[in-house]
């Protein structure tokens, strides 16, 4: 607890101190008082620099004095023989003896007092920026006219903050200008312009005249810009150091000026206008400005246009351009928007073909599409090759943005038929050399794939069964083998206008127009064991003449047995109808003359007993393309015959290929065309 | 050359079991049905149970059915036919035949064209 | 089940007679039936399948006919190797039944 006075006695005092004692006082007085500490009796073993015995006093860090020896007072009025005056509230005083005397030593006594301090002469440091008044106990500030005391109740400064400009123009300039400005102070001046304006300060070189930098290059009195989080300066010296024209990017700006005690100059003067934000004019690759300007300012507006194979994307819709506003921040609006390279996105996949997975969908790539070779080729053309186009689609020379579309190569079996005796007379075959080859088991009978969605037959076969089960890709039809072949399900039977329908259809003399269509549910897969044979052409090239050879197959009849279980094959010539004719035939249903004969059926066999049978109906007669030797075409139809092993009746195929292509487009579905 | 080899018969008690085999060569075996038909000494010939290519259908006559039952292994080229709760009039000689199967959804049986030479089975306390 | 009826139960002959054996079924079988000759101590073998079509390798001495319900195996002119039980196989539904079997022995 600080007190105004005491005393500080050595021990055993006025006896002989102790050997070996070190004994310290921390004496304090009230704040705003120093200490005068006095010795009226001083009696320590002298030693040089004290260094046996002494009292030492300290003040703060720094030692005040340390003393030793017998000492008497100058002044016979005073008895004071050592004396200390420290203007602080602090002090300490130790005491050190050390394990000896020779003589016997008395010590000392002292004491002090709370006295008095000048804060305003006794320190290097001048508590007052400008007038200093002592009191006992303390000391207190006061500023000239005009000055205001800070809140730290040492400095004095003039009232110069606070102004607030908002007009798009203005001057300021410092206190007193062009008169010196005051010391010690710090003027804050606000410019809060509307956004979209940016403050733009201009000052003349002469109009500035600031207290200039030491010589470590620190400005002692400063006039510094804030804009945001730049800033522009501190500026001093006599001429404006900084541009003339600071363009601070910004509607709001802060005027800092702060001085020193020292160095009073005429201070400065600055102009200051809004200009609508600049916002820059960006580089955005692959695009188009309009309008073109050399300057954009707030609320300008422009329609960002990409090039040709660039959009812009947006969430998940692409356009081809958008609008940016220049903004009161001095930046352009939808800025993230880019004009990117236009993607086509991965190429559609086609059915019966494939396209390559494309390194790039993006504008300018290329894809080349292709059919599964040898089954299917590219019926409209163009190449399969697509490119990327600027519209976002993938885009053939030929057909622009319309797939390819791979269809069936038709009557190509991938093994030739080689005779080796069976069918009636016929060979064993396999259905690689038929692959066309149909097989209905109710009833036991043949058709013949024409395409994916259609197989050809006999009208005789479907029309005690409208709904057929089919099989390709088996030469052999054990129950075993077709479980694991293709069934194909039909959709509709399209049996021919002409044909005449019976009440009892196994009384049947005329077979005329013995041709049906069945549409399929779904469509066939080709490959080396299914696919279809070619219609035949409308020319004269399609007429067959006499001799001319045609293949047939199926499961039918043999001379071993009633169903063959694999397939057989013959290499049939075509002859004369009347040839057919001459036949008797074999287990007449009726009269041998009503048997009818027309120019819609060929005549065909007769060679080696080679022929069809019961169970081969509708089941091609294949003969070559005399314009494509590598094809096969469907001449004709296994319909009827007088006697199996002479000659058959055969539908004569080019008389309803009109029929064919017209029942075929009518009753197509939109995935076929 | 097409065989069939029956296999498993025997003297076996009433009531009691016997598992007969049919070993199948000389033809694809899972192409075609299977059939077993006896003889009893001196009698005519009775079919007992058909079993289709791939084992997915089976027949039965009257008499032995839910004692008897058909089965294959195609990967094996075997046919069987376990017999159980057996009873003297079972006395017999059993023959497997093979059936061929033509046709898809409407088929064509074609039954018995080739037979085995048959293994006997003795039912007799 | 379909019954099969066979007759006569037995016969004898000549070499060289025309023989006749009849079945008939208890209900209409279409043409789902087949011949079978069985010689004694031998194996049952196909002549006839799907009422008259000749098994591959028999003599064309055999022959069949017939749909519905009555079915008839005629052997043209016998031969002494045609000595033999011949027995008729309905296949047209489960389960398949034989007809009792007619023995042709020498006259």
């Known amino acids: 607890e600080p007190t105004m006075y005491g005393e500080i006695l050595s021990p055993n005092y006025p006896q002989a101190y102790p050997s070996e004692v070190e004994k310290s006082w921390d004496i304090e007085v009230p704040e705003g008082y120093g200490i005068h500490l006095y010795f009226t009796h001083l009696d320590i073993e002298l030693s040089e620099n004290c260094a046996y015995d002494s009292v030492q006093i300290i003040s703060g860090d720094t030692e005040e004095g340390r003393l030793c020896g017998q000492r008497s007072s100058n002044n016979p009025h005073s008895p004071i023989v050592e004396e200390f005056q420290v203007p602080y509230n602090k002090l300490q005083v130790i005491f050190k003896s050390d394990f000896s005397n020779e003589e016997r030593f008395t010590g000392f006594a002292a004491y002090y007092v709370a006295t008095d301090i000048n804060e305003c002469t006794d320190f290097v440091d001048v508590p007052c920026s400008h007038f200093c008044n002592n009191f006992i106990g303390g000391y207190f500030c006061s500023c000239p006219p005009e000055y205001f005391l800070h809140d730290d109740m040492k400095n004095c400064g003039v009232n110069c903050s606070g102004d607030v400009f908002t007009a798009l123009i203005g001057e300021i300039a410092s206190p007193n200008y062009p008169k010196p400005y005051p010391e010690n102070s710090r003027c804050e001046y606000q410019i809060r312009l509307e956004k979209g304006f940016q403050v733009v300060v201009t000052l003349r070189r002469e109009d500035f005249d600031v207290e200039a930098a030491d010589s470590a290059g620190n400005c002692l009195d400063s006039l510094v810009f804030v804009a945001g989080d730049r800033q522009f300066g501190p500026y001093c010296g006599h001429g404006f150091p900084g541009p003339l024209n600071i363009e601070t990017k910004s509607n709001a700006l802060d005027i800092i000026f702060q001085t020193d005690l020292t160095g009073q100059k005429k201070g400065w003067k600055l102009r200051y206008h809004g200009d609508p934000m600049p916002c820059p004019k960006e580089d955005t690759p692959n695009s188009v400005w309009e309008p073109a300007k050399a300057k954009y300012v707030f609320r300008d507006v422009v329609q960002i246009t990409c090039l040709d194979g660039f959009e812009v994307v947006e969430g998940r819709v692409g356009a081809t351009s958008f609008y940016s506003t220049c903004q009161s921040n001095g930046k352009w609006s939808n800025s993230k928007l880019k004009c990117q390279p236009v993607d086509c996105g991965i190429p559609e996949s086609i059915e019966n073909g494939k396209v390559e997975d494309p390194e790039s969908t993006l504008f300018g790539s290329v894809i080349r599409y292709t059919c599964e070779e040898p089954y299917y080729y590219m019926e409209n053309g163009g190449g399969g090759e697509y490119h990327c186009a600027g519209n976002g689609s993938w885009v053939n020379e030929v057909l622009g943005p319309e797939l390819p579309k791979c269809v069936p190569v038709c009557g190509v079996p991938r093994e030739p038929f080689e005779e080796k005796q069976r069918i009636i007379g016929g060979s064993d075959a396999d259905i690689k050399n038929f692959p066309w080859q149909v097989f209905f088991d109710n009833p036991w009978a043949g058709g013949a794939l024409i395409n994916e969605y259609w197989v050809l037959t006999a009208a005789h076969v479907v029309e005690g069964n409208r709904e057929p089960t089919m099989y390709v890709g088996s030469t052999s039809v054990q129950t075993s083998r077709l479980a694991k072949s293709k069934m194909l399900t039909p959709e509709h039977v399209f049996i021919h206008p002409g044909w005449k329908l019976l009440e009892v259809p196994e009384g049947r003399t005329n077979f005329d127009n013995d041709i049906a269509l069945v549409r399929l549910k779904d469509p066939v897969k080709m490959g080396p064991t299914v696919s279809p044979i070619c219609l035949p052409g409308t020319s004269s090239d399609y007429n067959l003449m006499d001799g001319d050879l045609g293949l047939i197959s199926g499961w039918g009849r043999t001379e071993k047995r009633d169903r063959a279980v694999r397939l057989k094959a013959a290499r049939l010539p075509v002859a004369p109808l009347r040839k057919c004719k001459e036949v008797k035939v074999e287990k007449p249903t009726a009269d041998a003359e009503a048997y009818v004969f027309t120019p819609n059926m060929i005549c065909a066999g007769g060679e080696k007993g080679m022929d069809s049978c019961k169970g081969d109906s509708g089941g091609a007669f294949a003969v070559q393309d005399p314009n494509d030797k590598t094809k096969f075409y469907a001449a004709g139809l296994v319909s009827w015959g007088p006697q199996c092993g002479t000659y058959g009746l055969y539908t004569r195929v080019k008389n309803y290929v009109d029929w064919i292509m017209k029942t075929m487009q009518e009753n197509s579905t939109p995935r076929e065309d | 050359e097409v065989q069939l080899v029956e296999s498993g018969g025997g003297v076996v008690r009433p009531g009691g079991s016997l598992r007969l085999s049919c070993a199948a060569s000389?033809?694809?075996?899972?192409?075609?049905?299977m059939s077993w038909v006896r003889q009893a000494p001196g009698k005519g010939l009775e079919w007992v149970s058909g079993?289709?290519?791939?084992?997915?259908?089976?027949g039965y006559a009257d008499s032995v059915k839910g004692r008897f039952s058909i089965s294959r292994d195609n990967a094996k080229n075997s046919l069987y036919l376990q017999m159980n709760s057996l009873r003297a009039e079972d006395t017999a000689l059993y023959y497997c035949?093979?059936?061929?199967?033509?046709?898809?959804?409407?088929?064509?049986?074609?039954?018995?064209?080739?037979w085995g030479k048959g293994t006997t089975v003795t039912v007799s306390s | 089940d379909i019954q099969m009826t066979q007759s006569p139960s037995s016969l004898s002959a000549s070499v060289g007679d025309r023989v006749t054996i009849t079945c008939r079924a208890s209900?209409?079988?279409?043409?789902?039936l087949g011949w079978y000759q069985q010689k004694p101590g031998k194996a049952p073998k196909r002549l006839i399948y799907?009422?008259?079509n000749l098994q591959s390798g028999v003599p064309s001495r055999f022959s069949g006919s017939g749909s519905g319900t009555e079915f008839t195996l005629t052997i043209s002119s016998l031969q002494p190797e045609d000595f033999a039980t011949y027995y008729c196989?309905?296949?047209?539904?489960?389960?398949?039944?034989f007809g009792g079997g007619t023995k042709v022995e020498i006259k």
């Open positions: 035949a093979r059936d061929e199967q033509l046709g898809g959804l409407k088929y064509y049986y074609y039954y018995m064209d080739v």
């Open positions: 000389g033809f694809t075996f899972d192409d075609y049905g």
């Open positions: 079993i289709n290519w791939e084992g997915g259908s089976t």
């Open positions: 209900q209409g079988i279409r043409n789902d």
């Open positions: 799907t009422a008259s």
């Open positions: 196989l309905q296949t047209n539904i489960y389960p398949l039944t």
